[in-house]
């Protein structure tokens, strides 16, 4: 069971300081942006991180949403990352969900975060280059100290 608590507005960056945004095709991508670029591209660069209480606590449970015309929420259904047109629900009556991630602070690096899927233990949000695009994907942590699964989260509230 997950029960919704508060939400905050955040900018998410990878460790190369590229900003996460949602493009016109609803794809989550990373791109180099100045602070003014980041502001100019809002609300596509502003993510709503909603915290949830967890009946079986395994870390800070969150959903990641974005509000452009409508609210879309990040999902990792079948280990494929996509934004689904939906509001983060008030309650989820299950111990796993494709839209719930555990936001983890990396020990020794308080400002570096990882997002582990609640549906697929050991799978994390990651940034991966594919041709000329830097995409948000779900990947199994396969090497120690993998920088691709680490992010910074800057609160905009």
């Amino acid at each position: 069971y997950f029960g919704k608590l508060e939400s905050k507005l955040s900018v998410i960056r990878n460790l190369n300081d590229q900003v996460l945004f949602i493009d016109q095709g609803n794809r989550p991508l990373f791109e180099d942006m100045t602070d003014s670029d980041c502001r100019d591209n809002a609300p596509r660069t502003i993510f709503i991180i909603s915290m949830y209480k967890d009946s079986q606590p395994r870390g800070m449970a969150v959903t990641i949403s974005v509000k452009c015309e409508k609210i879309s929420t990040l999902s990792c259904e079948n280990k494929i990352i996509s934004f689904k047109e939906m509001n983060p629900p008030d309650n989820i009556k299950d111990t796993k969900s494709d839209i719930i991630f555990f936001q983890r602070s990396v020990p020794g690096h308080d400002n570096k975060m990882q997002f582990e899927s609640s549906s697929y233990e050991g799978y994390f949000l990651a940034c991966e280059k594919e041709r000329d695009l830097f995409k948000l994907i779900l990947k199994k942590e396969d090497e120690l100290g993998d920088r691709s699964i680490m992010f910074t989260v800057q609160n905009e509230d």
């Epitope: 608590l5 209480k53 606590p57 602070s105």
Partner: antibody, heavy 119, light 110 residues
Amino acid sequence: EVQLVQSGAEVKKPGSSVKVSCKASGGTFNSYAISWVRQAPGQGLEWMGNIIPYSGFAYYAQKFQGRVTITADESTSTAYMELSSLRSEDTAVYYCARAAYHPLVFDNWGQGTLVTVSS
Amino acid sequence: DIVLTQPPSVSGAPGQRVTISCSGSSSNIGNHYVNWYQQLPGTAPKLLIYRNNHRPSGVPDRFSGSKSGTSASLAITGLQSEDEADYYCQSWDYSGFSTVFGGGTKLTVL
């Protein structure tokens, strides 16, 4: 750099209660869990329970259920552990520990508070 | 009361490699992650290894963790005098949301 600073040593009589505090500085207090772990003289570590300030949930080890109360005050970034019905076997160093990665991965520890229970 | 079993003591000469074992069961190590803590004399414990084999920043790569089945181990290579401490393994049980520690192993550097 996160720091956890605990209250000072206590001497208590059997049957009484003790309340130990743990003040956090640095980091975001309500985005991680605070556990309490004790260590009797010359013995190992024993988890007592924790609180997750952002959800308000507290969890207790079965052994301490009904005798321990863990609370948190977000306005002062302070967690508290109260243990009642004290007995001599409760003489120990009590540690608070922060868990920012997982509620049971203790990545920062307080300096410890010695609680002595003696008549 | 102690669910995870560790040897009470291990020793090694400077520069040597030592391992500390931690034995559990399917209800803890078999199905969950293992963490290791180092406790230097008179100080609070410190996180050494988390999630079986991850090192927090600042922990030398001389320390490594591994897990197989219902057992875990901590290896320390290039032993140094400052490694003399007590080492504790820890695992947890999601369903009961509780955690268990090993009894601790005292490492002596000869």
